[in-house]
Interface confidence: low
C-alpha cells in the first residue's frame, strides 16, 4: 500500500523548491524499478515529484490566503512491466499559515452618534477588524484592539472592539471627535502586524443649556402715536444647544401696567416686544418690565439644567409726539333764539394742546358767513338768524396750535336756532269759493285751514274771525271748528249775480303764541246762477266755472 504522512507546505517560501514530503509504496525496495507520477491541479507547475524516490517539492511561492489546500493524485508504475503497482490515490497538501496579513477594518468609514453628557461606560460603536490569516493557526489572526487617539473621552474593549465613553463630553465645547483604533494580531506579541481605523464620533445635542439673555438690560423706545400691536423692538437670548433644544419661548414676568406683551419669533428665536395698550407720553413717559425666557422643550431628566429661567429688564422710553389740539368735547350743541342781533353770543368751545409745552390755540370756522369765533373759542353771530330760513347750523370748528400750525383738530358744532313767534298764521292755500243766487241761509260755502311758519312749542292753535266790518255787514259768517279749521256759511237767503257778482271776505287768523300774532286773509266768493237743483248755470267768470268743473250750456 501507499505510505505517506500529512503534507504541509509553508506559504510565502522564497526558495526555488521546498521539500514537501515523500510518497512511496511499501512494495518499493529502493532498486529504482518504480516510477512515481503526480497528477491533478498544480501537478507539474506548483508541485513536482521525483519519479524515482517519490519526493514531492513545491516549486512556486504559495499563498495560503489565495489557496489553502491542493488535492493531487499519485500513481506508481513498475517500469519493468509498465503496470501500476498501487491503485491511483488522492492525497492533500495543506498550505500552512504564516502571519503575513495585517488586520483590516472592512466596514470603514466608521461614524457614530452618541448623546453628549452620556455617562461613563455608554456604548458608542463596535469596530471589527478582519485578518486573512488562519484563525486556527496559532495567534496569527487573534486580534487585540487599542486606542491610539481619543483619550480621555473614549476607551476600547481590547478583545471586542467595543468603543465606550470614558469621560463626560460636552457638545458645546466640541461636537465631534476622531478616534483612532489599532487592531494588532498575534494578540500583540512581538512580530504582530497592525491595522488602524478612524471613527468619527459625533455628539448629538441634549438640552443641557437653558437660554440666557445676551443683555441684562434692554433699552427700547415706543412712539406715543404707535397703535396697539406695534412691534417696538426685539430681545434675544442665546442657547448653546441646537435644533429643537435651542427653541425658546419668551414671556413677560413683570409688567404692572399690563401695557406690553412679548411674542416669540420661532424662526429667529427672538422675543418681539409688542404694544398691548396705547401709551401716552404726557401720562407716563417710561416703563420698566421684566421678561423671562425658557426652552420650549425640556425633558424631565434634564430639568436640573433649567431650574431658574433667565430674566432681563427692559426699559421702554415713550417718545413724545406733537399731538393735535384736543377739544374738551367730541362735539358741541348750542342754542340761540332767532332774530337776536348780530354779534350775539352763541357758545364757547375749548381745545388744549395735550403736549407738555401747551401751545396756545387758534380757532376758526370753516366756510360760515353767519358765525364768527375768536381766539378764546367764543362763537358769535355775524347776522340776525331766521329760524324759518334755517333751524340748524352744522359748523366745523378747527383748532390749530400756534407753535405748529400743522397740528389741527376739527369738531362739529351744531347750532339750533330757537323759535320766536314772529309769523302770523295764514291760509294754508289760496281759496276761491262760489255761492248760488238762490242759496239759503246757513249754507256751507268753504272750509278753510291755516298754517304758521313758526315752530310750535306745544301744538299750534289758530282762532278764526271775520274782520269787524265784515262781521257787521257780512252776508257770510264763520264758525271756528276748534281744530285749526273753520267753515264759511251764508248769512242770508238769496244773492244777485247782477248786483253783487263777487264778495271779498276778510278773515282774521290769530295764533296762540305769546304775544299772539294775527293776519288778515281774503276769501273771494263768486255768485253764480244755479238751477233749482243747485247746479251752477252761469257765473261771472266762465274760466272759474271751468276750473271748478262746471259745464255751460
Amino acid at each position: 500500500g501507499w505510505v505517506w504522512n500529512q503534507f504541509f507546505v509553508p506559504e510565502e517560501m522564497n526558495t526555488t523548491s521546498h521539500h514537501v514530503g515523500r510518497l512511496r509504496s511499501d512494495l518499493d525496495n529502493g532498486n529504482n524499478s518504480f516510477q512515481y507520477k503526480l497528477l491533478g491541479a498544480g501537478a507539474g507547475s506548483t508541485f513536482i515529484i521525483d519519479e524515482r524516490t517519490g519526493d514531492i517539492y513545491a516549486i512556486e511561492k504559495l499563498d495560503r490566503e489565495e489557496r489553502s489546500l491542493y488535492i493531487l493524485r499519485a500513481q506508481v508504475i513498475d517500469i519493468t512491466t509498465g503496470r501500476a503497482v498501487e491503485p491511483e490515490s488522492e492525497f492533500v497538501i495543506k498550505v500552512s499559515d504564516i502571519n503575513d496579513n495585517e488586520p483590516k477594518f472592512l466596514d470603514e468609514p466608521y461614524e457614530a452618534i452618541v448623546p453628549e453628557m452620556s455617562p461613563e461606560g455608554t456604548l458608542v460603536i463596535q469596530v471589527t477588524a478582519s485578518d486573512a490569516d488562519d484563525p486556527s493557526s496559532g495567534n496569527n489572526a487573534r486580534l487585540l484592539y487599542s486606542l491610539l487617539q481619543g483619550q480621555p473621552y473614549f476607551s476600547v474593549e481590547p478583545t471586542t472592539g467595543v468603543i465606550r465613553i470614558s469621560s463626560k463630553m460636552d457638545r458645546e465645547l466640541q461636537d465631534e471627535y476622531w478616534v483612532i483604533i489599532q487592531a494588532k494580531d498575534m494578540i500583540g506579541q512581538p512580530g504582530a502586524l497592525s491595522g488602524t481605523t478612524s471613527v468619527l464620533i459625533k455628539l448629538s445635542d441634549v438640552n443641557d443649556n437653558k437660554p440666557i439673555f445676551k443683555e441684562s438690560l434692554y433699552r427700547l423706545t415706543v412712539s406715543e402715536s404707535a397703535p396697539t400691536g406695534t412691534s417696538i423692538g426685539t430681545i434675544m437670548a442665546y442657547d448653546n444647544d441646537i435644533g429643537e433644544n435651542a427653541e425658546m419661548d419668551y414671556s413677560i414676568e413683570e409688567d404692572d401696567s399690563q401695557t406690553f406683551d412679548i411674542i416669540t419669533n420661532h424662526e429667529t428665536q427672538e422675543g418681539i416686544v409688542i404694544l398691548k395698550k396705547k401709551v401716552n407720553f404726557e401720562h407716563q413717559n417710561h416703563y420698566g418690565i421684566r421678561a423671562k425666557v425658557k426652552n420650549h422643550h425640556v425633558d424631565e431628566q434634564l430639568m436640573k439644567y433649567h431650574t431658574e429661567a433667565s430674566t432681563t429688564f427692559i426699559k421702554i422710553q415713550v417718545e413724545d409726539v406733537d399731538e393735535p389740539p384736543l377739544f374738551l368735547l367730541p362735539y358741541y350743541i348750542f342754542e340761540i333764539f332767532e332774530e337776536t342781533p348780530q354779534g350775539s353770543f352763541v357758545g364757547v368751545v375749548s381745545a388744549t394742546d395735550p403736549d407738555n409745552r401747551k401751545s396756545p390755540i387758534r380757532y376758526s370756522i370753516t366756510r360760515s358767513k353767519v358765525f364768527n369765533i375768536d381766539d378764546n373759542g367764543t362763537i358769535t353771530t355775524t347776522n340776525s338768524l331766521d329760524r324759518e330760513i334755517s333751524a340748524w347750523y352744522n359748523l366745523s370748528i378747527t383748532a390749530t396750535e400756534k407753535y405748529n400750525i400743522e397740528q389741527i383738530s376739527s369738531i362739529p358744532v351744531y347750532v339750533q336756532v330757537l323759535n320766536i313767534n314772529d309769523h302770523a298764521p295764514e291760509f294754508s292755500q289760496y281759496y276761491e269759493s262760489y255761492v248760488c243766487e238762490n242759496a239759503g241761509s246757513g249754507q256751507v260755502i268753504q272750509t278753510i285751514s291755516a298754517v304758521d311758519r313758526d315752530e310750535s312749542i306745544e301744538e299750534h292753535h289758530f282762532y278764526f274771525n271775520l274782520s269787524v266790518e265784515d262781521t257787521n255787514s257780512s252776508s257770510f259768517t264763520i264758525i271756528d271748528n276748534q281744530d285749526n279749521t273753520a267753515v264759511i256759511l251764508t248769512n242770508r237767503t238769496g244773492f244777485n249775480l247782477q248786483e253783487e257778482p263777487i264778495f271779498y271776505i276778510s278773515i282774521l287768523i290769530a295764533d296762540n303764541g305769546i304775544p299772539s300774532l294775527t293776519s288778515t286773509n281774503t276769501l273771494t266768493i263768486h255768485v253764480c246762477d244755479c238751477d233749482d237743483s243747485g247746479s251752477t248755470q252761469t257765473c261771472q267768470y266762465q274760466e272759474l266755472m271751468l276750473s271748478m268743473g262746471f259745464k255751460t250750456e
Epitope: 469621560s167 431658574e308 433667565s310
Partner: antibody, heavy 120, light 111 residues
Framework: QVQLVQSGAEVKKPGASVKVSCKAS????????MSWVRQAPGQGLEWMGI????????TYAQKFQGRVTMTGDTSTSTVYMELSSLRSEDTAVYYC?????????????WGQGTLVTVSS | HSVLTQSPSASGTPGQRVTISCSGS????????VNWYQQLPGTAPKLLIY???QRPSGVPDRFSGSKSGTSASLAISGLQSEDEADYYC???????????FGGGTKLTVLG
C-alpha cells in the same frame, strides 16, 4: 491676557454685610461663568457659588444659601458678591475665579483676592 | 471635612517623582472632569491640570494628571524646590449641584 481685579480689603463688624467686586477685562464677559471661592486663614479652598453674568443666573453652595447674593453688571463687566450676617468665621480671603461656558468646567483665571476681616 | 479626600501632606527630594491622590465618588470624580490647582504661599491659586490630564500652556510637562473611576492623581516628576506649594483637586458634583475642593495637600521639597 484675561484680568480679574478685585476690590480692596474690608474690616466689618459681626452682623454687618460686605460687598466685594471683581472687574473683568480682555475677554467676552457675558460668555463665561464666574465663581467665588474663599480661603480662611490656614485653611483650604471653599466654593461659595457661581453666576452667569448674562442674565444673572446663580447657583449657591448649600452652606451660603440665604446669606450670599451674586450679581453682575454687563455695562461695567463687573461681578459682585455680597455676604450678609457676617460672623467671625467669615474672616477669609475671597477670590473670584473665571469658569467655563459650562457650570462644571474648570476655573482658568483667578482674581488677586480680597481679605475680609470680621471683628468686633 | 471635604467631599474629596486628599492626603494632607507629601514630600520628596529634588529630582524625585511624587504623586498626590484625590478620592471622590460617582457623582463627582466618577462623572466629571478633575482639575488641579497649585497655590504658592501668599498667592492666588493657579490652574495646573484641567479635564483630568490636560496642561494649560506654561505648565511644565513634569506635571501630569490621571483619573480612574472615582479617584484621580497628580504626578510631579523631577521635583524642584519651586514646586513647594499647596495642591488642590476640584471637580463639579452632580448631586450637590456645585463645585467641591479637596482639603489640599502640602508638598514639601526636602533638602
Amino acid at each position: 491676557q484675561v484680568q480679574l481685579v478685585q476690590s480692596g480689603a474690608e474690616v466689618k463688624k459681626p452682623g454687618a454685610s460686605v460687598k466685594v467686586s471683581c472687574k473683568a477685562s480682555r475677554y467676552t464677559f457675558t460668555s463665561y461663568y464666574m465663581s467665588w471661592v474663599r480661603q480662611a486663614p490656614g485653611q483650604g479652598l471653599e466654593w461659595m457659588g457661581i453666576i452667569h453674568p448674562s442674565g444673572g443666573d446663580t447657583t449657591y453652595a448649600q452652606k451660603f444659601q440665604g446669606r450670599v447674593t451674586m450679581t453682575g453688571d454687563t455695562s461695567t463687566s463687573t461681578v459682585y458678591m455680597e455676604l450678609s450676617s457676617l460672623r467671625s468665621e467669615d474672616t477669609a480671603v475671597y477670590y473670584c475665579a473665571r469658569g467655563g461656558i459650562k457650570l462644571w468646567l474648570h476655573f482658568d483665571y483667578w482674581g488677586q483676592g480680597t481679605l475680609v476681616t470680621v471683628s468686633s | 471635612h471635604s467631599v474629596l479626600t486628599q492626603s494632607p501632606s507629601a514630600s520628596g527630594t529634588p529630582g524625585q517623582r511624587v504623586t498626590i491622590s484625590c478620592s471622590g465618588s460617582r457623582s463627582n470624580i466618577g462623572s466629571n472632569f478633575v482639575n488641579w490647582y497649585q497655590q504658592l504661599p501668599g498667592t492666588a491659586p493657579k490652574l495646573l491640570i484641567y479635564t483630568n490630564n490636560q496642561r494649560p500652556s506654561g505648565v511644565p510637562d513634569r506635571f501630569s494628571g490621571s483619573k480612574s473611576g472615582t479617584s484621580a492623581s497628580l504626578a510631579i516628576s523631577g521635583l524642584q524646590s519651586e514646586d513647594e506649594a499647596d495642591y488642590y483637586c476640584a471637580v463639579w458634583d452632580d448631586s450637590l449641584n456645585g463645585w467641591v475642593f479637596g482639603g489640599g495637600t502640602k508638598l514639601t521639597v526636602l533638602g
